[in-house]
Interface confidence: medium
Amino acid sequence: RSTEQGESCSGLLGADAKLAGNTHQHIFNDLSGSVSLAWVGDGTGVILALTTFQVPIFMITIGQSKLYRSEDYGKSFEDVTNLINNTFIRSDFGIAIGPENSGKVILTADVSGSHGSRIFVSSDFGKSFTHQELPFVPLMQITYNPENSNVLLALSNKNELWLSEDFGTNWKKLYDTVCLAKWGRKGTIFFTANHNGSCSNDRGMLELERTTDYGKSFKTVASKIYSFGLGGKFLFASVMTGKGTLRAIHVSVDDGDTWNMAQLPSVGQEQFYSILAANDDMVFMHVDEPGDTGFGTIFTSDDRGIVYSKSLDRHLYTTTGGETDFTNVTSLRGVYITSVLSEDNSIQTMITFDQGGRWTHLRKPENSECDATAKNKNECSLHIHASYSISQKLNVPMAPLSEPNAVGIVIAHGSVGDAISVMVPDVYISDDGGYSWTKMLEGPHYYTILDSGGIIVAIEHSSRPINVIKFSTDEGQCWQTYTFTRDPIYFTGLASEPGARSMNISIWGFTESFLTSQWVSYTIDFKDILERNCEEKDYTIWLAHSTDPEDYEDGCILGYKEQFLRLRKSSVCQNGRDYVVTKQPSICLCSLEDFLCDFGYYRPENDSKCVEQPELKGHDLEFCLYGREEHLTTNGYRKIPGDKCQGGVNPVREVKDLKKKCTSNFLSPEKQNSKSNGSAGGSGGLNDIFEAQKIEWHE
């Protein structure tokens, strides 16, 4: 393991008494069927809880909502339903919280059968609400301009695009027959519209429009659009190619002023593209395989989003529910976990530590046996349960968890064998970003990270009522239990403030007596368990991505290594809300590993050298870039996006402007070759799928 390990477990003295004095019960006099929670602002302690009870009758839904507000991280709640005039709030739109610490909140009322709708808005963290009538019925949650929370964008159920510049008081209609709309950078709005049809048919005949002045003027930036997506600095559009039903990805890095065709396989009607992750450096793109295979290929882009390297074959991404296990491990740079579908249809977990350059199986946890799925009892891997397992209703209550401020920590359900098993999983933890793993808890659990990793909290997943919470102050090595109530509750969820900086955890559930059930929450503050602030002596230096301490280049990933100050496992102290991860980067010498293969080149398997594609040998590498024909002089390498290496290997690369006008057709389907692209990809979800903080764009 990466940091010091394993003193024998001895419980913290007086923990029960300390926690008992910091456990706050709140019983809601409420029989509603569902509850949604939202934290308003960062570090404010304000939580809004919306309970909803609804019954569908014929074509309409009737119901009631109650709104509760806490100012102390959930220790107590006040019923503030009167602030929303006892109106039924649409739970499917949730509670729309404004960006940053704006304190803004929008609740959308359900006004069944009317031509308009109503919203309740707050600018003071939910202390007070005013209601505004809408001249339309929203199709989805109203969205804030990320840079100006007074400006709101909404799509109506008649596919009209509406905008308000005064936080919902006044609205103006911007456009008709709008199929999809998104905020871009600096108040830019992108949307697809069909000028002579509807959104339900004619996919592929849409115009991509842009407005930079809140709808005073519009510019058509692309035509024959199937769908579009934004990721990092990139604007992607899937465009019909003119070859029947094929479509291809075009990319822009200047908000649609200029476009280039991405070096990716075209896809047919029943396939899809999906941006799995994107930042300002690069993008992970999934291209679905033809046929209903349930898998496709992951490609990683260069810094322009134009040239792509094949990253991973047989990547699991089902058509049916649009499920993929692709997970960004936010606790360590460059690490991603996902699943592949083997030839025998079993699912195996793969991990990359270098942003998709190489993928490997997860190392078998030292304290675990290979299960009976393993052909060889001494050689097997850890396989992680994520979205796909959850969608298949396996006994997996939570997806993998990592937090940027809990450096190196990854928690996930898994099984140890040759492939994912349907058997009841256990919970595993890595403290080094996924290089090594340990079984942390037997059986399925809910888990959360508090105080930037200083405390991990877990609750057993059970169909029976529960009253025990488990916690660990040493990154999951040793666990203590605390009975938070004498009367067990039917558990529905763990809630802690996003960002993993809080020391409060709320346990939500309901109590059931002979005739009634009611919501109840228990909020536990761990501040007295971590009774002192951490000092310098509580931290130790840790080199991330270290696999061979003898090697001078040990820890080098994407051209630099990082040393972190990590909390010692033996230290029981508070990182605190203001904790900032301390890291010291150092630049590495360049090697071929720091370069991807340039246009016209590919890497043979298990080789770090890029070789010329046979069919392009001896040809001038001319291609179209920004509307001019370019001549590329290269020995086959281009630096990986975000790679900071210096010195060492330095392959020559030069692009000459051939001063000829051209159009982006260097990747018309007949010129594509599978050497660098792999095969094109499988069966397609035709609806856009939005998965918050996960999949950036699914066509």
Epitope: T318, E343, N345, A372, G417, I420, S421, M423
Partner: antibody
Framework: EVQLLESGGGLVQPGGSLRLSCAAS????????MNWVRQAPGKGLEWVSA????????YYADSVKGRFTISRDNSKNTLYLQMSSLRAEDTAVYYC??????????????WGQGTTVTVSS | EIVLTQSPGTLSLSPGERATLSCRAS???????LAWYQQKPGQAPRLLIY???SRATGIPDRFSGSGSGTDFTLTISRLEPEDFAVYYC??????????FGQGTKLEIK
């Protein structure tokens, strides 16, 4: 409705050949591994052969290895078993079964009605 | 090669009684990959249980499966007349890819 329908069985002499077919309907054929299972008169079930969804991987019981060939045509939703060098002990009802779908093994959840192969002189 | 041995070979019970059928593997089998089938005369087998304990679609809840490692059990809590048949256990994933037990005949007493 999910269905498998075998055909091609019959009487054949020892050393002879026969090709069994299995037409699938009601599900996405290419997403599933497929199997042949046989049952000799008055005996239990014996797995014969399996093939992956794409057709890229094939598997055989030792008793038929080198004599039987499993294949599939996903465009026609059809599974095949080419049997050669047939022996008296290959006499059985041959069932086509649906095997593993994406991800988890859910048993052989769909069976055909069976086709009878008799090897006799 | 994994050998599955079912016991008893024949089980004679009356409707309404409880039936317990056993399947023992010669070496450890993943519970994920153990299934039970029912076969009536002149019919194709029908999947009852997969993953050692999960009931297949449409199977009544009087059928249940349990066990792990080398010992697995199929239980029919209250026998109905239509339950009298031959029952096979099956493992998946080792070499050979599938192995069936020799079967247990459940007959009316």
């Amino acid at each position: 409705e999910v269905q498998l329908l075998e055909s091609g069985g019959g009487l054949v002499q020892p050393g002879g050949s026969l090709r069994l077919s299995c037409a699938a309907s009601g599900f996405t054929f290419s997403s599933y591994a497929m199997n042949w299972v046989r049952q000799a008169p008055g005996k239990g079930l014996e797995w014969v052969s399996a093939i992956s969804g794409s057709g890229g991987s094939t598997y055989y019981a030792d008793s038929v290895k080198g004599r039987f060939t499993i294949s599939r045509d996903n465009s026609k939703n059809t599974l095949y078993l080419q049997m050669s060098s047939l022996r008296a002990e290959d006499t059985a009802v041959y069932y086509c079964t649906r095997g593993r779908g994406i991800g988890y093994y859910n048993g052989m959840d769909v069976w055909g009605q069976g086709t009878t192969v008799t090897v006799s002189s | 090669e994994i050998v599955l041995t079912q016991s008893p070979g024949t089980l004679s019970l009356s409707p309404g009684e409880r039936a317990t059928l056993s399947c023992r593997a010669s070496q450890s089998v993943s519970s994920s990959y153990l299934a039970w089938y029912q076969q009536k005369p002149g019919q194709a087998p029908r999947l009852l249980i997969y993953g050692a304990s999960s009931r297949a679609t449409g199977i009544p809840d009087r059928f249940s499966g349990s066990g792990s490692g080398t010992d697995f059990t199929l239980t029919i809590s209250r026998l109905e007349p239509e339950d009298f048949a031959v029952y096979y256990c099956q493992q998946y994933g080792s070499s050979p890819m599938y192995t069936f037990g020799q079967g247990t005949k459940l007959e009316i007493k």
